[in-house]
């Protein structure tokens, strides 16, 4: 922390400008009025201050606003935002999407920092839900943002916001997250026709139940293998060979290359070998002819 010393004669800053880069840290502390800094924060961005000088400027703002900065200052923080700690940010009340965008821009191209995560958390909590405009903004800066949320947090995403989600935004989502997002997507896209619906819902299908996959198999969707491999194993297992053939269409041939991987491997083990042979792909490992299959889980449920 910089010692309190009187400002040398003639050095009192009348405005925030480039002459301040020639000030030593103690001179900045002594000669820059915090209220002046707060009203001219937008100028700081255009001046190549050292990180040490930025520390002094931040200290002055902290003294002026011990309870947290007002949004008028936050919006113009620019690269001073990188000096903020999550504890600083928790004191803020950020309500404007423009402010959020301005601060995300500062961190653009970098991984999501703890500061950014805290900022987003404060913003979303302040809004009460993850609305479409916010989601649009966040996924534009951080394609993986959606998958960084817990299932509980995802439950606050309204179905209307799902329109903002791009396939790449879901790349790192796990099944628990897709379980929450899929019903919302189904609701959001329910009024679309078959082929358009499939294009939109495809990235969310990792959360789809068996009955929805059965319904899709009746619609000539030609699901690609990459999508099929991301389906829930428990949703794929009850599908018949005929249903999988209809679901995949011409892509059914790709099953051979994936026969050792889930969910294909587990699905093969549940099918009659006779039925698998009808595909003509040489898939092995099905239930031999003449064997009786007992579904023990069903029996346990009944007893």
């Amino acid at each position: 922390e910089v010692e309190k010393t009187a400002c040398p004669s003639g050095k009192k800053a009348r405005e925030i400008d480039e002459s301040l880069i020639f000030y030593k840290k103690w001179e900045l502390e002594a000669c820059v009025d915090a209220a002046l800094l707060a009203t001219q924060m937008d100028r700081v961005n255009a001046i190549p201050f050292t990180y040490e000088q930025l520390d002094v400027l931040k200290h002055k703002l902290d003294e002026l606003y011990p309870q947290g900065y007002p949004e008028s200052v936050i919006q113009h923080l620019g690269y001073l935002f990188l000096k903020m700690s999550p504890e600083d940010i928790r004191k803020w009340n950020v309500t404007s999407l423009e402010t959020l965008k301005a601060l995300l821009e500062v961190n653009k191209g970098h991984e999501m920092s703890p500061q950014v995560a805290t900022l987003i958390d404060r913003f979303v909590k302040g809004r009460g839900q993850l609305d479409k405009d916010t989601l649009d903004t966040l996924t534009a800066f951080y394609p993986g943002y959606l998958c960084s949320l817990s299932p509980e947090e995802l439950s606050s995403v309204p179905p209307s916001s799902i329109w903002a989600v791009r396939p790449q935004d879901l790349d790192t989502c796990d099944p628990r997250q897709l379980d929450v997002l899929y019903p919302k997507a189904r609701l959001a896209f329910q009024n679309m026709n078959g082929s358009e619906y499939f294009v939109k819902i495809q990235s969310f299908l990792g959360g789809a139940p068996t009955e929805d996959l059965k319904a899709l198999s009746q619609q000539n969707v030609s699901m690609d293998l990459a999508t099929f491999m991301k389906l829930r194993t428990d949703a794929v297992l009850p599908l018949t060979v005929a249903e999988v053939q209809k679901l995949l269409g011409p892509h059914v041939e790709g099953l051979k290359a994936e026969e050792r991987h889930r969910p294909v491997r587990d699905w093969i083990l549940r099918q009659r070998q006779d039925d698998l042979d009808t595909l003509g792909l040489g898939l092995q490992g099905g239930i031999p002819n003449g064997y009786l299959v007992l579904d023990l889980s069903m029996q346990e449920a009944l007893s």
């Epitope: 961005n45 190549p48 690269y79 821009e105």
Partner: nanobody, 117 residues
Framework: LQLVESGGGLVQPGGSLRLSCAAS????????IGWFRQAPGKEREGVSY????????NYADSVKGRFTISRDNAKNTVYLQMNSLKPEDTGVYSC????????????WGQGTSVTVS
């Protein structure tokens, strides 16, 4: 995306050096540039400044009349011409770029060493 300084070296008192600050991976046109120096064990201090257009320049009192800052946007480079060098000018010189017009990016170079002895 980085700034690379060059032109430093060992020079006798009264001699001259010309430092260069070249941008790699981005265009300097929209950036104000500052030259800073840090002597061993001392605080880093501002030496010179040039606006993005080149229309405005500024200098620390200790170098006024001896140092001249200029820019060649076509070459994506800013220069610091240092004349009448003194032993107290010794230090590591680095340049910094700050974005104007709401561009929040800022870049620092690694520095080039100047020894006046």
């Amino acid at each position: 995306l980085q700034l690379v300084e060059s032109g430093g070296g060992l020079v006798q008192p009264g001699g001259s050096l010309r430092l260069s600050c070249a941008a790699s991976g981005f265009t300097l046109d929209y950036y104000a540039i500052g030259w800073f120096r840090q002597a061993p064990g001392k605080e880093r201090e501002g030496v010179s400044y040039i606006s993005s257009s080149g229309g405005s320049t500024n200098y620390a009192d200790s170098v006024k009349g001896r140092f001249t800052i200029s820019r060649d946007n076509a070459k994506n480079t800013v220069y610091l011409q240092m004349n009448s060098l003194k032993p107290e000018d010794t230090g590591v010189y680095s340049c910094a770029a700050a974005g104007c017009y709401g561009n929040s990016s800022r870049y620092w170079g690694q520095g080039t060493s100047v020894t006046v002895s």
